[in-house]
Interface confidence: medium
Amino acid sequence: QRFAQAQQQLPLESLGWDVAELQLNHTGPQQDPRLYWQGGPALGRSFLHGPELDKGQLRIHRDGIYMVHIQVTLAICSSTTASRHHPTTLAVGICSPASRSISLLRLSFHQGCTIASQRLTPLARGDTLCTNLTGTLLPSRNTDETFFGVQWVRP
Amino acid sequence: QRFAQAQQQLPLESLGWDVAELQLNHTGPQQDPRLYWQGGPALGRSFLHGPELDKGQLRIHRDGIYMVHIQVTLAICSSTTASRHHPTTLAVGICSPASRSISLLRLSFHQGCTIASQRLTPLARGDTLCTNLTGTLLPSRNTDETFFGVQWVRP
Amino acid sequence: QRFAQAQQQLPLESLGWDVAELQLNHTGPQQDPRLYWQGGPALGRSFLHGPELDKGQLRIHRDGIYMVHIQVTLAICSSTTASRHHPTTLAVGICSPASRSISLLRLSFHQGCTIASQRLTPLARGDTLCTNLTGTLLPSRNTDETFFGVQWVRP
């Protein structure tokens, strides 16, 4: 009986439906390979329900297994550009707390101008995810070409 | 108490588990870049539980945040074909109602013969999703090479 | 009332939250194109909640529609390596029971060194999923470059 009532009274966030989809805000200064993200209905189709942004990086608010996905498209790019500037690599990882720092997802562009992937991974409340783009090419800020998101899947 | 009883009595669709996975039916006539999809157990491993097809395009029946995913493989393709016929681009977007028209996901083939990606996006009842393949190359109709689907994630 | 009580008493697995994320263990002997997977918290960020491993292949324990995803990166690879060793192809399929054998997802590497994709597909208890890598190139065992997983989505 208690569970049924709880379901009726609690907001969606307490049912574990944490989810976020972010769009690129800007790249970091020269020695900082991180991409800086933004989200919210005023910005288009990006949103944060549960997770939060901390200086452009995504911070998790609920323990659980998450589906993490990303697509990054390089801005002024052809297959010859991409191969000439190789290696250009995108890595998604936990960057803080430092004790949990790990790379979760890594892809190189080789002769392509877009990478896209997804994976399931356990994340804990307080984990901050960083997306590092190494190389000299710049990412597109078009919201249908570059995006990053997480979806809570189960405890 | 009411919630528990509702859960027992309502079909899955009313719990918000809308989901669809489609296979390619055919390409459009020459000036129509849209791919036309089909789904249903008689056709193999494709299905529609909630969303519907409207003249080969996917129409959403329930408001919510969806995971949209797609893979398209070109039919006669090598890396040289792909680069010679560049740009070949795949875009997934809301094409109707016109007031909500927007591109959600866009990828170019460059020197590759397959694109695959996914993203989270809010969709509303009545939104119709179109998948536009621009360029002169044709998609494979093999069901393990070309497919398109959506999964309701949360309200 | 019964549903609410059941929810309180049953473990997560009985709510249908089957999920697995695997890392590469090893490749098969010369005539066996299958990749052999492993999972478990002792191995890093891989896990099995519901599905099981049977001689390195993933066996499903619950009927339903699943999101299947994979990323495979070739180990010592550049775009010239990839094109010189073409065709290198990755296929994910049901390999047993033999009566249900079918290819679910197929990608070629062409001039790239990583493939990544995902799809929704119905799977039944007892289905075993195999991932076949054909060609002469070897996959990377880095856990952020090569992984394979499934997530139960709905009945």
């Epitope: - | 039916n25 008689a42 056709l43 044709l138 | -």
Partner: nanobody, 119 residues
Framework: EVQLVESGGGMVQAGGSLRLSCAAS????????MGWYRQAPGKQRELVAL???????NYADSVEGRFTISRDNAKNTMYLQMNSLKPEDTAVYYC?????????????WGQGTRVTVSS
């Protein structure tokens, strides 16, 4: 059921031309992808040309600019015009149709016609 019957194969000198035909019967002709595969001795079957119901075409790199695929929906026939033939074009050429039937996807193949190009 779809039946596909090829004709037009034969022997030809390098640099010469041949025109293959594929007559289809048994289903509406205009809505499926059709194409030509070939298989050379000891090699895998490869798709060399593809055409849609409304005439969009694609070619393998090895034949682009030399081969032309076309179809005549009124006659339920597809063609492959092969010019500037090379010895490496020697193969058995198969007509192919890809159609959705009520019970799922069907792929149909002809019995093949042999093309031999001598140098």
């Amino acid at each position: 059921e779809v039946q596909l019957v090829e004709s037009g194969g034969g022997m030809v000198q390098a640099g010469g031309s041949l025109r293959l035909s594929c007559a289809a019967s048994g289903k509406p002709f205009s809505f499926y992808f059709m194409g030509w595969y070939r298989q050379a001795p000891g090699k895998q079957r490869e798709l060399v040309a593809l055409i849609t119901g409304d005439g969009m075409t694609n070619y393998a790199d090895s034949v682009e600019g030399r081969f032309t695929i076309s179809r005549d929906n009124a006659k339920n026939t597809m063609y492959l015009q092969m010019n500037s033939l090379k010895p490496e074009d020697t193969a058995v050429y198969y007509c192919y149709a890809d159609v959705w039937a009520g019970a799922g996807r069907d792929e149909y193949w002809g019995q093949g016609t042999r093309v031999t190009v001598s140098s």
